[in-house]
């Protein structure tokens, strides 16, 4: 039975040209995390595998950094980075947990006033 829950940074905004940390946290389960995938709607960004370590998609190698922890840092943000991001926790014995983050990349002056809030 899957008892865990994923907490995410929810809906976030960031400045064009800046960087942002995508972070998820799995709680309320004793399941072992064996792999975490970071995904966009149509492609994989990165994998953190307990045995194999990090794999960063070549399309993102120049501006994606692993961490902190199981999170992902996106750098040199562009407006095209706006959209959904998913963390997928592969666990044993529970199975797969999914968290969703929506990132909006704004022009510098707008981002300063951008609200940050968490989706439960």
């Amino acid at each position: 039975m899957m008892t865990g829950t994923i907490e995410t940074t929810g809906n976030i905004s960031a400045e064009k040209g800046g960087s942002i940390i995508l972070q998820c946290h799995l709680s309320s389960t004793t399941a072992q995390v064996t792999q975490v995938n970071w995904e966009q709607q149509d492609q994989l960004l990165a994998i953190c595998n307990a045995d194999l370590g990090w794999h960063i998609s070549p399309s993102f190698k120049d501006r994606v950094a692993p961490g902190p922890g199981l999170g992902l840092t996106l750098q040199s943000l562009t407006v095209n980075d706006t959209g959904e991001y998913f963390c997928i926790y592969h666990t044993y014995p529970d199975g797969t947990y999914t968290g969703r983050i929506f990132l909006e990349v704004l022009e510098s002056s707008v981002a300063e006033h951008g609200a940050r809030f968490q989706i439960p």
Epitope: E39, L44, I47, F86
Partner: antibody, heavy 119, light 107 residues
Framework: DVQLQESGPGLVKPSQTVFLTCTVT??????????WSWIRQFPGNKLEWIGY???????TYNPSLTSRTTITRDTPKNQFFLEMNSLTAEDTATYYC???????????WGQGTTLTVSS | DIVMTQSHKFMSPSVGDRVSITCRAS??????VAWYQQKPGQSPKLLFY???YRYTGVPDRFTGGGSGTDFTFTISSVQAEDLAVYYC?????????FGGGTKVEIK
């Protein structure tokens, strides 16, 4: 339980357009994070992904088929559709609809509908 | 597009045999490979995702593994009901692409 069921005309003539329907039960096609895909399987068993409509309504096609395909949906009826034009004999295949997860894998499939393009 | 190659089109094990089906990706896909089973007259069924993660209800005699470009799907002790075509699929990027399939026929 999630179920998908395809329906279509079965036989169409070359150069014509076909309209296939996928009826989904057990889950709303607007349920977050899922994509609703069309996949075809040619007589030699080869599988080809055609495209999907996302829960939010955005649509993505296989670039090799973009010019000939249109995917739409009817959310009140919980159906999504594939329209393919300029058909040739090479489009003869079994057409499946499937649910696609965030990981881009297909966890539920319909039984398939056979399309034969022949004069 | 990422090309997925299954080098063996057919395999003919006896009941109880161990069978390994291989799949090669044309570029590094990390662990983003899924495996499907298609029995005669049926639609494909998901068996594994992320190379080694067993989908719900899949028997323990099936295992998946690999990373990078080389992936393996293994049946530790083939049963008569395992007669099917097995496909790999990369779920790394779009368009999603499948291998050509490996047909397992029981001797």
């Amino acid at each position: 339980d999630v179920q998908l069921q395809e329906s279509g005309p079965g036989l169409v003539k070359p150069s014509q357009t076909v309209f296939l329907t996928c009826t989904v039960t057990g889950i709303s096609i607007t349920t977050g994070n899922y994509k609703w895909s069309w996949i075809r399987q040619f007589p030699g068993n080869k599988l080809e992904w055609i495209g999907y409509i996302y829960y939010s309504g955005t649509i993505t096609y296989n670039p090799s088929l973009t010019s000939r395909t249109t995917i739409t949906r009817d959310t009140p009826k919980n159906q999504f559709f594939l329209e393919m034009n300029s058909l040739t004999a090479e489009d003869t295949a079994t057409y499946y609809c499937a649910r696609e997860t965030v990981l881009r894998v297909f966890d539920y499939w319909g039984q398939g509908t056979t399309l034969t393009v022949s004069s | 597009d990422i090309v997925m190659t299954q080098s063996h089109k057919f395999m003919s094990p006896s009941v109880g045999d161990r069978v390994s089906i291989t799949c090669r990706a044309s570029q590094d896909v990390g662990t983003a490979v899924a495996w499907y089973q298609q029995k005669p007259g049926q639609s494909p069924k998901l068996l594994f995702y992320s190379a080694s993660y067993r989908y719900t209800g899949v028997p323990d005699r099936f295992t998946g593994g690999g990373s990078g470009t080389d992936f393996t799907f293994t049946i530790s002790s083939v049963q008569a009901e395992d007669l099917a075509v097995y496909y790999c699929q990369q779920h790394y990027s779009s368009p999603r692409t499948f291998g050509g399939g490996t047909k397992v026929e029981i001797k």
